[in-house]
């Protein structure tokens, strides 16, 4: 940055190089150039010469004043007009930053996604600070009192192998930047209570033309957790409101869920699960689309039909790549 230049003098900022956004600030420039009594001192912000609010303090020093400075970053430098010099002479430069102290981190959440081998902790950092803000995640065993700290700039993944102080911990987050420091409340966790089962995935759907047509959704998870509660939500793509069905699930085999749906309508399905009685849900699965056939199904694609046991016809949808869920962060 501009701070690496060779200086023939000194530039400084009051109250500080990093300051609260919206403050009034003063930038001082003091020349120390051999054989030069500056006729004039000039200030530049991001390469553009400033015209106003410049005060000459003495023969070698001038001040530039800004009211209500709102730019997150700016490069400042100052120059001198020296007698017998055709060009301005560079005195010095400085990068300045404005921003806010951190808010108190809240909504601290830690979960273990099954098979990940990590505990993932996230939090709400609050308003944008505009300046470099670091977070220290503290994890303290309620059994051994041992504490581990992890420095990060956003969320953190902590290897569960490193959590050797038993099952019960306190977790809290400390936020710090040049303008201040804040700390969250302490979250008490038990490692067995924060496991989120392996993702549930909808693999295919078929509509069977029985007396009353029904749609079967096939879905599965690789979870080894025995007691799992799931929700499947579905709606016509033209609707705003979701319908939700709840299931107590045993994933020793592929799940089949039956729905009686309107004909000739495109539906979207999502599923999510949690360990029964625990706090955290999976994010909703990827969107799965399925269009129900007309009342008397029209055979439109060989790929999506085959004979079924009730002599009806089947219209099927198969999961390939799906759009990502609009609620992937919904774990509360």
């Amino acid at each position: 940055g501009i701070t690496n230049i060779n200086c023939s003098g000194h530039i400084w900022v009051e109250p500080a190089t990093i300051f609260k956004m919206g403050m009034n600030i003063s930038i001082y420039c003091q020349a120390a150039i051999k054989n030069c009594q500056p006729r004039k001192l000039h200030f530049y912000k991001n390469g553009i010469k400033e015209r106003f609010q410049i005060t000459r303090i003495n023969k070698t020093t001038a001040r530039l004043w800004y009211k209500n400075f709102l730019e997150p970053h700016a490069s400042m430098y100052c120059t001198a007009e020296c007698p017998k010099h055709f060009q301005e002479t560079l005195i010095c430069g400085k990068d300045i930053s404005s921003g806010y102290p951190p808010d108190i981190p809240d909504e601290v959440t830690c979960v273990i996604y099954e098979y990940s081998g990590n505990m993932t902790c996230t939090w709400n950092a609050g308003k944008l600070t505009y300046i470099d803000t670091k977070y220290v995640v503290h994890v303290k065993s309620l059994e051994t009192e041992e504490e581990q700290q992890y420095l990060t700039s956003s969320y953190i993944n902590i290897s569960t192998d490193s959590l050797q102080g038993g099952k019960k911990y306190l977790v809290w987050v400390q936020a710090a930047n040049a303008l201040g420091m804040e700390e969250s409340k302490q979250l008490q966790i038990h490692l067995d209570d924060i496991v989120i089962p392996s993702a549930a995935v909808i693999s295919r759907a078929e509509t069977i033309n029985a007396t009353v047509p029904k749609t079967i959704i096939y879905w599965d998870s690789q979870t080894t957790i025995e007691k799992v509660s799931c929700e499947m939500r579905y709606k016509a793509t033209t609707n705003q409101t979701w319908n939700v069905k709840e299931f107590d699930t045993n994933f020793t085999y592929v799940q089949q869920s039956e729905f009686y749906l309107e004909p000739n309508i495109k539906y979207v399905f999502q599923v999510r699960c949690q360990e029964t009685g625990k706090r955290y849900w999976q994010p909703w699965s990827s969107l799965f689309f399925h269009k129900t056939p007309e009342t008397v199904p029209q055979v439109t694609s060989k790929a999506f039909q085959h004979d079924t046991w009730n002599s009806g016809l089947t219209v099927a949808s198969i999961s390939t790549g799906h759009l990502t869920s609009d609620n992937r962060g919904d774990i509360g």
Epitope: T144, Q149, Q186
Partner: antibody, heavy 121, light 112 residues
Framework: QVQLQESGPGLVKPSETLSLTCTVS?????????MCWIRQPPGKGLEWIGC?????????YYANWAKGRVTISVDTSKNQFSLKLSSVTAADTAVYYC????????????WGQGTLVTVSS | DIQMTQSPSSLSASVGDRVTITCQAS??????LAWYQQKPGKAPKLLIY???KLAAGVPSRFSGSGSGTDFTLTISSLQPEDFATYYC??????????????FGQGTKVEIK
Amino acid sequence: QVQLQESGPGLVKPSETLSLTCTVSGIDFNSNYYMCWIRQPPGKGLEWIGCIYVGSHVNTYYANWAKGRVTISVDTSKNQFSLKLSSVTAADTAVYYCATSGSSVLYFKFWGQGTLVTVSS
Amino acid sequence: DIQMTQSPSSLSASVGDRVTITCQASENIYSFLAWYQQKPGKAPKLLIYSASKLAAGVPSRFSGSGSGTDFTLTISSLQPEDFATYYCQQTNRYSNPDIYNVFGQGTKVEIK
């Protein structure tokens, strides 16, 4: 045998900076640990000054009465910890202790014997 | 700011007496509390940590109890070497920007 040894001048002039070093031997420090400084003014109770956490990063914590005046630092290669307290007054006259458990707990199994620092002109 | 309030500030007791000292935290500190014994001219000595765990080499007449905000140190049968000053210390967290002191004010146990 665990030993914590505080060292530094016993007399400091008002407005100057008090500087103490704690040299630790006999402790196999864990990967994460706390080292703390505590003081005790004559005839009074224990006063926490601050701690340094040493792990994958270094973090310092100070009592709010000492903020802006105190700096705690570590030289891990020498197992030495230092305390600097600036702008001292007569109220900073005390026995200064360093203390640790050699791990990342905040109770102290091991203490130095303490060193008396007098602030006087 | 977590504040530690210890009581009484002093007490007189005889050898063989059961002595109880209490410590109250201004907020929940779980079981993160330690007790120390200090004799004149000496550094403090750890007696109890995690509210109720006896430190190595400490006689079993010393015991600690409590969690959350209220804690107790009990000496079941006071011995001549137990006359000293006792301090509680919260060991929950020091990262809070507003901590003034982590120790209680101390309780001096004197001979009656």
